[in-house]
Interface confidence: medium
């Protein structure tokens, strides 16, 4: 599991691999702060509720964020 509260940042290891948006239950973006100097993106998968840390610099992940925000803006009135 790439998550730990024992370090300053939540994510220990990050994935560069793309994520199918249909597999996502939730996408959490934690901004950089005094506790962790980098942006962290945590994906909760529908299957087994497994959590994965995604690389914010990966083009595939940037595209995913775009797709998710586009979907959200469609839903909001």
């Amino acid at each position: 599991v790439p998550l730990s509260r024992t370090v300053r940042c939540t994510c220990i290891s990050i994935s560069n691999q793309p994520v199918n948006p249909r597999s996502l239950e939730k996408l959490e973006i934690i901004p950089a702060s005094q506790f962790c100097p980098r942006v962290e993106i945590i994906a909760t998968m529908k299957k087994k509720g497994e959590k994965r840390c995604l690389n914010p610099e990966s083009k595939a992940i940037k595209n995913l964020l775009k797709a998710v925000s586009k979907e959200r803006s469609k839903r909001s009135p």
């Epitope: 994935s15 560069n16 691999q17 793309p18 994520v19 199918n20 597999s23 998968m45 299957k47 497994e50 994965r52 690389n55 610099e57 990966s58 083009k59 595939a60 595209n63």
Partner: antibody
Framework: EVQLVQSGAEVKKPGATVKISCKVS????????MHWVRQAPGKGLKWMGW????????TYADDFKGRFTFTLDTSTSTAYMELSSLRSEDTAVYYC????????????WGQGTTVTVSS | DIQMTQSPSSLSASVGDRVTITCKAS??????IAWYQQKPGKAPKLLIH???TLQPGIPSRFSGSGSGRDYTFTISSLQPEDIATYYC?????????FGQGTKLEIK
């Protein structure tokens, strides 16, 4: 040295099933997603889809949904592509290709596996 | 899906010639294009990614340029060993698409 080594050529009858393997070496298998590409005789390259090597989740291109199955054996660092209900138009060379996920292009390819479907 | 229109489909040139192949995307692909060389019976070989970044070990006679929807691949001085089929690949989104290919022959 990073290598993707595919299984040998196959000759199958229509309606049969074929399973191609792609064994990787020289890098950590689960660090990169694996993609599959088809090339029919005398034709161009067609992207078939990919499998996330961390989760095992496959994604298929529209033209390759239904009869195609991508799987993994992480213990042997091997990706598989299975094709069922073979037809003559499935005759092609099938390539596995490592995706350089941080940017998304295919940087290393297998040597290709020729599948011939003939009665 | 993004379509990639590659031209010409074939071309004949002499050793030493400057050769240009183009790929036009159906929408802006943000410079996410790669170029591959494929010789008969062999797997494609990556030459260039992100429009113009040459892979290590690839001769400098190969180059790429472009932006938006229009991209160009150039061989500045054609060598006999460059005889092959060349493909562009767009990887701007997770539905990858190749151009139709350009078969390059020596005059």
């Amino acid at each position: 040295e990073v290598q993707l080594v595919q299984s040998g050529a196959e000759v199958k009858k229509p309606g049969a099933t074929v399973k191609i393997s792609c064994k990787v070496s020289g890098y950590t298998f689960t660090d990169y997603s694996m993609h599959w590409v088809r090339q029919a005789p005398g034709k161009g390259l067609k992207w078939m889809g990919w499998i996330n090597t961390e989760t095992g989740e496959p994604t298929y291109a529209d033209d390759f949904k239904g009869r195609f199955t991508f799987t993994l054996d992480t213990s042997t660092s091997t990706a598989y592509m299975e094709l069922s209900s073979l037809r003559s138009e499935d005759t092609a060379v099938y390539y596995c290709a490592r995706n350089y996920d941080y940017d998304g292009y295919f940087d290393v390819w297998g040597q290709g596996t020729t599948v011939t479907v003939s009665s | 899906d993004i379509q990639m229109t590659q031209s010409p489909s074939s071309l004949s040139a002499s050793v030493g010639d400057r050769v240009t192949i183009t790929c036009k995307a159906s929408q802006d692909i943000n410079k996410y294009i790669a170029w591959y060389q494929q010789k008969p019976g062999k797997a494609p070989k990556l030459l260039i990614h992100y429009t113009s970044t040459l892979q290590p070990g690839i001769p400098s006679r190969f180059s790429g340029s472009g932006s938006g929807r229009d991209y160009t691949f150039t061989i500045s001085s054609l060598q006999p060993e460059d005889i092959a089929t060349y493909y562009c690949l767009q990887y701007d989104n997770l539905l990858f698409t190749f151009g139709q290919g350009t078969k390059l022959e020596i005059k």
